[in-house]
């Protein structure tokens, strides 16, 4: 069975109303520009076959992909929210840098790969969708990692 290592975030990360609000505002701005409402990136399929104790590691992978492959290319858009939310998410990513699981992470990698492929396939609209789901990313990190 997978064993988690340091897959933990302090609850205080999620107790700052200002940055919570900015994250939600950024997600809302992007979701208004997203007209592909049938596709959900952070939803039932992402968590399928992954036990709750391994979901922080799963969300770490999604967070890192979102930062590197989505927020970086779109960093000029959705200001001023983007310039405030990216450092916050980077801080969470750094706090999870030692989060690993030893054991079978096949389901996790498969689910993350599916998410990445969906974003890539949709191109820029996939990136917009991922930004529009930052509220879900935020809540999922809180649920899984605290």
């Amino acid at each position: 069975l997978p064993v988690n290592t340091r897959c933990k975030l302090e609850v205080s990360n999620f107790q700052q109303p200002y940055i919570v609000n900015r994250t939600f505002m950024l997600a809302k701005e992007a979701s208004l520009a997203d007209n592909n409402t049938d596709v959900r990136l952070i939803g039932e399929k992402l968590f399928r076959g992954v036990s709750a104790k391994d979901q922080c590691y799963l969300m770490k992978q999604v967070l890192n992909f979102t930062l590197e492959d989505v927020l970086l290319p779109q960093s000029d858009r959705f200001q001023p929210y983007m310039q405030e939310v990216v450092p916050f998410l980077t801080k969470l990513s750094n706090q999870l840098s030692s989060c690993h699981i030893s054991g079978d992470d096949q389901n996790i990698q498969k689910n993350v790969r599916r998410l990445k492929e969906t974003v890539k396939k949709l191109g820029e609209s996939g990136e917009i969708k991922a930004i529009g789901e930052l509220d879900l990313l935020f809540m999922s990190l809180r649920n899984a990692c605290v």
């Epitope: 039932e44 709750a52 649920n143 605290v146």
Partner: antibody
Framework: EVQLVESGGGVVRPGGSLRLSCAAS????????MNWVRQAPGKGLEWVSG????????DYAASVKGRFTISRDNAKNSLYLQMNSLRAEDTALYHC??????????????WGRGTLVTVSS | QAALTQPASVSGSPGQSITISCTGA?????????VSWYQQHPGKAPKLIIY???KRPSGVSNRFSGSKSGNTASLTISGLQAEDEADYYC??????????FGGGTKLTVLG
């Protein structure tokens, strides 16, 4: 088959306390966030409290914050709601509810039948 | 936190389509990524019929569909049937880590 069975309701005086329990079966309990939702007689649904899979986050409606405490015992497949300083407006049927899928407790896909709490002098 | 706003009642004849709206301030529902809809028959526990805005749980009829636009989420029931007569509630998870419900809509199937 997913089953949620609430217990612990009853009649209590204003200012009194009750502890509700929810016994879960038919699924891996510690893979899911859980909630308490209440419904006053003839009224709508009101979310009371929620807890994530490991008890690390516990959230409350403003109307019960400071008076109610949610907890879970994963070894016993049980969810609890400790209710203190009860008021007449807390009178309701209290449901235990599980997230539809692991990772999103706010989609309440499975519900117990509820346990009735009556606060009356 | 104020409840989301739903019409108190809607009605329709068998075979018709009806739509129930659910409106909230942007602070309540963010981008509406968290919207769920529940059906409740008298004396029964609520039943999840839409989650994640527009997804249907297995076993729920495809006559039920969900959507969002701006600050309003909607539930549409097509091909109305007598057994659809019930109370319907929308809900959303919020940026304050709470769940808010709408006040509920009583659906009457005429005839």
């Amino acid at each position: 088959e997913v089953q949620l069975v609430e217990s612990g309701g009853g009649v209590v005086r204003p200012g009194g306390s009750l502890r509700l329990s929810c016994a879960a079966s038919g699924f891996t309990f510690d893979d899911y966030g859980m909630n308490w939702v209440r419904q006053a007689p003839g009224k709508g649904l009101e979310w009371v409290s929620g807890v994530n899979w490991n008890g690390g986050t516990r959230d409350y409606a403003a109307s019960v914050k400071g008076r109610f405490t949610i907890s879970r015992d994963n070894a016993k497949n049980s969810l609890y709601l400790q209710m203190n300083s009860l008021r007449a407006e807390d009178t309701a049927l209290y449901h235990c509810a599980r997230g539809w899928y692991s990772g999103a407790a706010w989609n309440m896909g499975y519900w117990g039948r509820g346990t009735l709490v009556t606060v009356s002098s | 936190q104020a409840a989301l706003t739903q019409p108190a009642s809607v009605s329709g004849s068998p075979g018709q389509s009806i739509t129930i709206s659910c409106t909230g301030a942007s602070g309540d529902v963010g981008a509406y990524n968290f919207v769920s809809w529940y059906q409740q028959h008298p004396g029964k526990a609520p039943k999840l019929i839409i989650y994640d805005v527009n997804k249907r749980p297995s076993g729920v009829s495809n006559r039920f569909s969900g959507s969002k636009s701006g600050n309003t989420a909607s539930l549409t029931i097509s091909g109305l049937q007598a057994e659809d007569e019930a109370d319907y509630y929308c809900s959303s998870y919020t940026s304050t880590f709470s769940v808010v419900f709408g006040g509920g809509t009583k659906l009457t199937v005429l005839g």
